[in-house]
Interface confidence: low
């Protein structure tokens, strides 16, 4: 005697999220009479996916008309697949009765959902760091399936190697997340640099997703200070120049002090950008030497991006022979420096 078989020809089906999944099922006999039902999972907790008899299943469409008397094809199409639909689906034949009795189940078809990773989001450090320091950038992407994924980091097109990547969860899941942290050593030339996190996944058909972060958000390039004095003018006025160069970001305050007293404070604004993204600024102070009897200590004080102030000082010695005034050499580039000018 020929026994009814329920055949599910595919052991597994893989579908991209948003697409439809077709789950095939054939019953080899019209006898005995009774409905077919589809379940996800096994045992008492299994989930009813489709029933010929009853219920509302808006996303499920039978491939063939199950009401036709001679129908033996009980394949279904599930629309708009999401990662939550992953699992093993069973086509089950029931014998008509009160209640219906489960007769035979197919071997099951595992549905795996290929879900695209979300656009990678790259976040940088909360506070700026200076050149030669190492900063961390984090890249996150979520919601992808299957779990296999490749993540690469680039800085200005060059692949980075110092990074750690985790894919969660470790076990089986309907979808996964990836988190990677890259360590990047900053240089003074990095204002225009960019880090890119590139995620490659089977769902992307060779078109990886990229997330970017600009190092301009993470870097602080402290200024160089150079204080110089021009030749004394005929009217006994000395023009002292404070050159503040190669700094980023633009937020900078410059204060001139004469003998420790604030003479003038200026804020940098609308400065032209250097090719490397940094800024330069020059400030002048005109000092009337004849108005001073004693030496004049001039200090150019620069506060950059909320950092402690950097000072450069000159001691201008009031001379009996002002016309012999020469030009002073630049002060040192660090710390507080004093020069006597004769």
């Amino acid at each position: 005697e020929e026994e009814l078989q329920v055949i599910q020809p595919e052991k597994s089906v893989s579908v991209a999220a948003g697409e439809s999944a077709t789950l095939n099922c054939t019953a080899t006999s019209l006898i005995p009479v009774g409905p077919i039902q589809w379940f996800r999972g096994v045992g008492p907790g299994r989930e009813l996916i489709y029933s010929q008899k009853e219920g509302h299943f808006p996303r499920v469409t039978p491939v063939s008309d199950p009401t036709k008397r001679n129908n033996m094809d009980f394949s279904i199409r599930i629309s708009n697949i999401t990662p939550a639909d992953a699992g093993t689906y069973y086509c089950v034949k029931f014998r008509k009765g009160s209640p219906d009795v489960e007769l035979k189940s197919g071997a099951g078809t595992e549905l795996s959902v290929r879900a695209k990773p979300s656009a990678p989001v790259v976040s940088g450090p909360a506070v700026r760091a200076t050149a030669e320091h190492t900063v961390s950038f984090t890249c996150e992407s979520h919601g992808f399936s299957p779990r296999d994924i490749t993540l690469k980091w680039f800085k200005n097109g060059n692949e980075l190697s110092d990074f750690q990547t985790n894919v969660d969860p470790a076990g089986k899941s309907v979808s996964y997340s990836i988190r990677s942290t890259a360590r990047v050593v900053l240089t003074r030339r990095d204002v225009h640099s960019q880090v890119i996190c590139e995620v490659a996944h089977v769902t992307l058909q060779g078109d990886p997703l990229r997330g970017t972060a600009n190092l301009s958000e993470a870097i602080r390039v402290p200024p160089f200070l150079e204080v110089t004095q021009q030749s004394m003018r005929a009217d006994n006025q000395v023009n002292v120049t404070c050159q503040v160069t190669k700094f980023y970001p633009q937020r900078l305050q410059l204060t001139w002090l004469e003998n420790g007293n604030v003479s003038r404070t200026e804020m940098a604004s609308a400065l032209p950008e250097n090719k490397d993204g940094t800024y330069n600024w020059t400030s002048w102070l005109l000092v009337n030497v004849s108005a001073h009897r004693d030496d004049v200590k001039l200090t150019c004080q620069v506060e950059h991006d909320g950092q402690p102030a950097v000072n450069k000082s000159f001691s201008v010695k009031v001379s009996a022979h002002p016309k012999e005034q020469g030009s002073n050499t630049a002060a040192e580039n660090t710390g507080t420096n004093e020069r006597n000018i004769y």
Epitope: A16, A17, G18, E19, K116, A119, H192, Q194, T203, Q205, D207, T212, N214, S216, E217
Partner: antibody
Framework: QVQLQESGPGLVKPSQTLSLTCTVS??????????WSWIRQHPGKGLEWIGY???????YYNPSLKSRVTISVDTSKNQFSLKLSSVTAADTAVYYC?????????????WGQGTLVTVSS | DIQLTQSPSSLSASVGDRVTITCQAS??????LNWYQQKPGKAPKLLIY???NLETGVPSRFSGSGSGTDFTFTISSLQPEDIATYYC?????????FGGGTKVEIK
């Protein structure tokens, strides 16, 4: 409410460089959160996306035009610009500047009124 | 590049009619799709973003649906001021691309 206004010559000779500027008012380019794009429309035809720039200077150009396109930004003037080199009659179009949400959810939610550029000798 | 195929390319309908435009993507773009309205001599105006979300200030007679590769734009009751060309645009992949447009006219 942000407004965008294109400006530049309406006539460009073949082989020369087309230069357009988009001035943004009612919002700051440098506040972030948006891409600043150029889109063009050939007479009686559909829309073609040219590329975008972020306030930081990051750009992406349509590969079909990449070799000829430069988009730049001047945050101090709240402007961004398009340069298209080696133009031909096929570059005759209405050029639009537009603002697009960085997260992609809001589309090009603000556009300029467009400026017609004719390439002819 | 992602191709977006809009259909029909033009249609003529009466005031009060329900108008439906479709946009098919050459590959899965999830719901990363916008719909624009462009009136003659004007810049495009965003109507629908993320396939189904109505942009602020846009009349509720406009709607959108779909996900993956097949999308639909509907005007539930056509008004004279709706005479325009309508474009779909994908932003799932760079470069962003537009559909060829659907010109809507009044009978």
């Amino acid at each position: 409410q942000v407004q965008l206004q294109e400006s530049g010559p309406g006539l460009v000779k073949p082989s020369q460089t087309l230069s357009l500027t988009c001035t943004v008012s009612g919002g700051s380019i440098s506040s972030g959160g948006y891409y600043w794009s150029w889109i063009r429309q050939h007479p009686g035809k559909g829309l073609e996306w040219i590329g975008y720039i972020y306030y930081s200077g990051s750009t992406y150009y349509n590969p079909s035009l990449k070799s000829r396109v430069t988009i730049s930004v001047d945050t101090s003037k709240n402007q961004f610009s398009l340069k298209l080199s080696s133009v031909t009659a096929a570059d005759t179009a209405v050029y639009y500047c537009a603002r697009e949400g960085l997260d992609g959810s809001y589309g090009s939610s603000a556009w300029g009124q467009g400026t017609l550029v004719t390439v002819s000798s | 590049d992602i191709q977006l195929t809009q259909s029909p390319s033009s249609l003529s309908a009466s005031v009060g009619d329900r108008v439906t435009i479709t946009c098919q993507a050459s590959q899965d773009i999830s719901n990363y799709l916008n719909w624009y309205q462009q009136k003659p001599g004007k810049a495009p105006k965003l109507l629908i973003y993320d396939a189904s979300n109505l942009e602020t200030g846009v009349p509720s007679r406009f709607s959108g649906s779909g996900s993956g590769t097949d999308f639909t734009f509907t005007i539930s009751s056509l008004q004279p001021e709706d005479i325009a060309t309508y474009y779909c645009q994908q932003f799932a992949y760079l470069p962003y691309t537009f559909g060829g447009g659907t010109k809507v006219e009044i009978k």
